[in-house]
């Protein structure tokens, strides 16, 4: 395996709670700044599997606002602009990392948490179960 | 904004870096458990805007492995199984939080970082620019 030497300038880890509790710098570095991603802001309307975005707000979590996608239809929009129920609109899910205040209401103490979010929808061919 | 009363049992915040540096409990709590068990999907193959998944690994980041979606086609798959270039396959992107070791190779000091990931693809009607 790749052996990583320990940096001699590392913070002290004598804390009795180490390694469960560590220091995290919240000055967020944004790796996306120089890239120019195509704006996906109107895909939710232009998609053949359009979705609505629901605001999920939790002041005890960072980020406190997460937008959840909910597919508008069971089927997909066809070329005529009608819903085709021979196809299915399904949510694309992703597990993400968030910080939760712990104990609650503490401004500088958090716990890592994984949550599952729906990011958008895609149109798929349905799985047809044939009854013998 | 929502005012949150400060919990009297909160850790001390006298650190000169506060509130930039906070304590984080790394024993990850999984909010998805039981309420929302994960169900495997092959949407990436069954979608009208199918995608491939590329493994992005960085041992200095948590999560170390992130799977990036890349749309297989510029167009979308039609009912005949052919690519229809009158429609566009586009990536659905999401900004996620990751933890990065800082300084590098330190086991107990991290910085939050935002990165943009492509989670999957969706089929959209193209924006047609008419030349006068």
């Amino acid at each position: 395996g790749i052996t990583i030497p320990r940096n001699p300038g590392c913070p002290n880890s004598e804390d009795k709670n180490f390694p469960r509790t560590v220091m995290v710098n919240l000055n967020i570095h944004n790796r996306n700044t120089n890239t120019n991603p195509k704006r996906s802001s109107d895909y939710y309307n232009r998609s053949t599997s359009p979705w609505n975005l629901h605001r999920n707000e939790d002041p005890e979590r960072y980020p406190s606002v997460i937008w959840e996608a909910k597919c508008r239809h069971l089927g997909c929009i066809n070329a005529d602009g009608n819903v085709d129920y021979h196809m299915n609109s399904v949510p694309i899910q992703q597990e993400i990392l968030v910080l939760r205040r712990e104990p609650p209401h503490c401004p500088n103490s958090f716990r890592l948490e994984k949550i599952l979010v729906s990011v958008g929808c895609t149109c798929v061919t349905p799985i047809v179960h044939h009854v013998a | 904004g929502i005012t949150i009363p400060r919990n009297p049992g909160c850790p001390n915040s006298e650190d000169k870096n506060f509130p930039r540096t906070v304590m984080v409990n790394l024993n990850i709590h999984n909010r998805n458990t039981n309420t929302n068990p994960k169900r495997s999907s092959d949407y990436y193959n069954r979608s009208t805007s199918p995608w491939n998944l590329h493994r992005n690994e960085d041992p200095e980041r948590y999560p170390s492995v992130i799977w990036e979606a890349k749309c297989r086609h510029l167009g979308c798959i039609n009912a005949d199984g052919n690519v229809d270039y009158h429609m566009n396959s586009v990536p659905i992107q999401q900004e996620i939080l990751v933890l990065r070791r800082e300084p590098p190779h330190c086991p107990n000091s991290f910085r939050l970082e935002k990165i943009l990931v492509s989670v999957g693809c969706t089929c959209v009607t193209p924006i047609v620019h008419h030349v006068a």
Epitope: P19, E95 | N27, N36, K38, S40, L53, Y62, V65, W67
Partner: antibody, heavy 126, light 107 residues
């Protein structure tokens, strides 16, 4: 290809402690987790606990809480499992296994144990 | 904790025969069920992950299906080398648990 090589067989007396090592090679050690699973003679598999090697966070089965300690040393790419207060019921083969530790995205995710060590036989007898 | 119950406990099968092992979870675990094969005096080996995803290097005769609480491991055309004990394992919630195992031997 990931390989996990465990330390050799141990014979212990009741009340003693045990520390088994699991040396990983191949892949990046901090990118995955290590779990410990044991198997008593003629019995099934039992999950004891695991560690997220990236930052040393641990999870333990309630049954072993307070008796088991799992650690990892990134510099040597080795995980350890220490079990104290041994009794004859702890006689078993102890396995370490890799937990891919990937975030769920519909198809790839964590907690299927895809590579296993060869096992360490532990006998507890007075 | 989530209890996994496998059936049967034991199966004696002739080569080329089809083998079906079931695993029932005490609550909904979605697709978070994995199957392992353990041969005598060997470490377990991952066969199927996430209920139905095959693992590289595993023969195509092994397949998995199911979701929720009921899962099946199928060996289509058993071979002599397939003798061993098969375990299911859930990773939905801690503590991770295994089924009691199904021993398959060759007639």
């Amino acid at each position: 290809e990931v390989q996990l090589v465990q330390s050799g067989a141990e014979v212990k007396k009741p009340g003693e402690s045990l520390k088994i090592s699991c040396k990983a090679s191949g892949g990046s050690f901090s990118s995955y987790g290590i779990v410990w699973v044991r198997q008593a003679p003629g019995q099934g598999l039992e999950w004891m606990g695991g560690i997220t090697t990236f930052f040393g966070a641990t999870d333990y089965a309630q049954k072993f809480q307070g008796r088991v300690t799992i650690t990892a040393d990134e510099s040597t790419t080795t995980a350890y499992m220490e079990l104290s207060g041994l009794t004859s019921d702890d006689t078993a083969v102890y396995y370490c296994a890799r937990d891919p530790n990937e975030f769920w995205n519909g198809y790839y995710a964590t907690h299927d144990f895809d590579y296993w060590g060869q096992g360490t036989t532990v006998t507890v007898s007075s | 904790e989530i209890v996994l119950t496998q059936s049967p406990d034991f199966q004696s099968v002739t080569p080329k025969e089809k083998v079906t092992i079931t695993c029932r979870a005490s609550q909904d675990i979605g697709s978070e069920l994995h199957w392992y094969q353990q041969k005598p005096d060997q470490s377990p080996k991952l066969l199927i992950k996430y209920a139905s995803s095959s693992t590289s290097g595993v023969p195509s005769r092994f397949s998995g299906s199911g979701s929720g609480t009921d899962f099946t491991l199928t060996i289509n055309g058993l071979e002599a080398e397939d003798a061993g004990t098969y375990y299911c394992h859930q990773s939905t919630s801690l503590p991770y648990t295994f089924g009691q195992g199904t021993k398959v031997d060759i007639k």
